[in-house]
């Protein structure tokens, strides 16, 4: 039975040209995290594997940095980076947990972070 929950940074906004940290945290389970995949809509951004470490997709190597922790740092943001991001936690024995973050990249200097929320 899957008892865990994923807490994410929720709906966030950031300035064009700036950076943002995407963070998810799995709690309420003793399952072993074997891998975390980060995806932007239908594109793989990065993978953090417990044994192999980080793999950053070649097309994002210049703008994506691993961490902190299991999170992901996006740099040199453009308006095209606006959209949904997913953290996919592969665990044993529970299976897969998915968290969602919506990032809005703003032209203006008014960029506020949204509230944290939980996805069961």
């Amino acid at each position: 039975m899957m008892t865990g929950t994923i807490e994410t940074t929720g709906n966030i906004s950031a300035e064009k040209g700036g950076s943002i940290i995407l963070q998810c945290h799995l709690s309420s389970t003793t399952a072993q995290v074997t891998q975390v995949n980060w995806e932007q809509q239908d594109q793989l951004l990065a993978i953090c594997n417990a044994d192999l470490g980080w793999h950053i997709s070649p097309s994002f190597k210049d703008r994506v940095a691993p961490g902190p922790g299991l999170g992901l740092t996006l740099q040199s943001l453009t308006v095209n980076d606006t959209g949904e991001y997913f953290c996919i936690y592969h665990t044993y024995p529970d299976g897969t947990y998915t968290g969602r973050i919506f990032l809005e990249v703003l032209e203006s200097s008014v960029a506020e972070h949204g509230a944290r929320f939980q996805i069961p």
């Epitope: 793989l44 993978i47 044994d51 793999h55």
Partner: antibody, heavy 118, light 107 residues
Framework: EVQLLESGGGLVQPGGSLRLSCAAS????????MSWVRQAPGKGLEWVAS????????YYADSVKGRFTISRDNSKNTLYLQMNSLRAEDTAVYYC???????????WGQGTLVTVSS | DIQMTQSPSSLSASVGDRVTITCRAS??????LNWYQQKPGKAPKLLIY???SLQSGVPSRFSGSGSGTDFTLTISSLQPEDFATYYC?????????FGGGTKVEIK
């Protein structure tokens, strides 16, 4: 240099058994998921089974479930495929492959031929 | 199960030609799509992983694109050593499935 070397193939009668081995070298075997993929003569590729590096996930194709068993011995850097109740349609070249990040098969062995015939 | 449909099943082309092979999944597989090249009597070789990432050591004339259900492998300028059979494969969910293959032959 990453190397995968399959062995154990051969001619077996229908209903018989074989155990294939895949000896791995050149990488930290226990860190990688591994898969078996087969190819019948003149046909395409068919996934058979996969096993995670350390956590206990194992997956099988429906066509072999209950007859084949995938296993690994990380101390020997070896992957196995125990094949029981073999059928003529199991005739194929069997490849082992390394699967980084449970995603893509980046290195393959040379294959071992299994022929099931009376 | 996710079905992978490749087209064409075979094609004839000349050295220097631009070749495009398509692969369609029966449901969305995000970018969990890989491409392999196989020559007769040899093991498959990984060309492209995660839909568009070029495997180390593979010539840059190979490229992949697509996401969701529709994917493309492109060889920008066909070389003599590229005549082979190409397979797509989804790793979105088990059972892992391959396309039926595309045989690229010399015209």
């Amino acid at each position: 240099e990453v190397q995968l070397l399959e062995s154990g193939g051969g001619l077996v009668q229908p209903g018989g058994s074989l155990r294939l081995s895949c000896a791995a070298s050149g990488f930290t075997f226990s860190s990688y998921s591994m898969s078996w993929v087969r190819q019948a003569p003149g046909k395409g590729l068919e996934w058979v089974a996969s096993i995670k590096g350390s956590a206990g996930y194992i997956y099988y194709a429906d066509s072999v479930k209950g007859r084949f068993t995938i296993s690994r011995d990380n101390s020997k850097n070896t992957l196995y495929l125990q094949m029981n109740s073999l059928r003529a349609e199991d005739t194929a070249v069997y490849y082992c492959a390394r699967v980084p990040y449970d995603y893509w098969m980046d290195y393959w062995g040379q294959g071992t031929l299994v022929t099931v015939s009376s | 199960d996710i079905q992978m449909t490749q087209s064409p099943s075979s094609l004839s082309a000349s050295v220097g030609d631009r070749v495009t092979i398509t692969c369609r999944a029966s449901q969305s597989i995000s970018s969990y799509l890989n491409w392999y090249q196989q020559k007769p009597g040899k093991a498959p070789k990984l060309l492209i992983y995660a839909a568009s990432s070029l495997q180390s050591g593979v010539p840059s004339r190979f490229s992949g694109s697509g996401s969701g259900t529709d994917f493309t492998l492109t060889i920008s300028s066909l070389q003599p050593e590229d005549f082979a059979t190409y397979y797509c494969q989804q790793s979105y969910s088990t059972p892992l499935t391959f396309g039926g293959g595309t045989k690229v032959e010399i015209k």
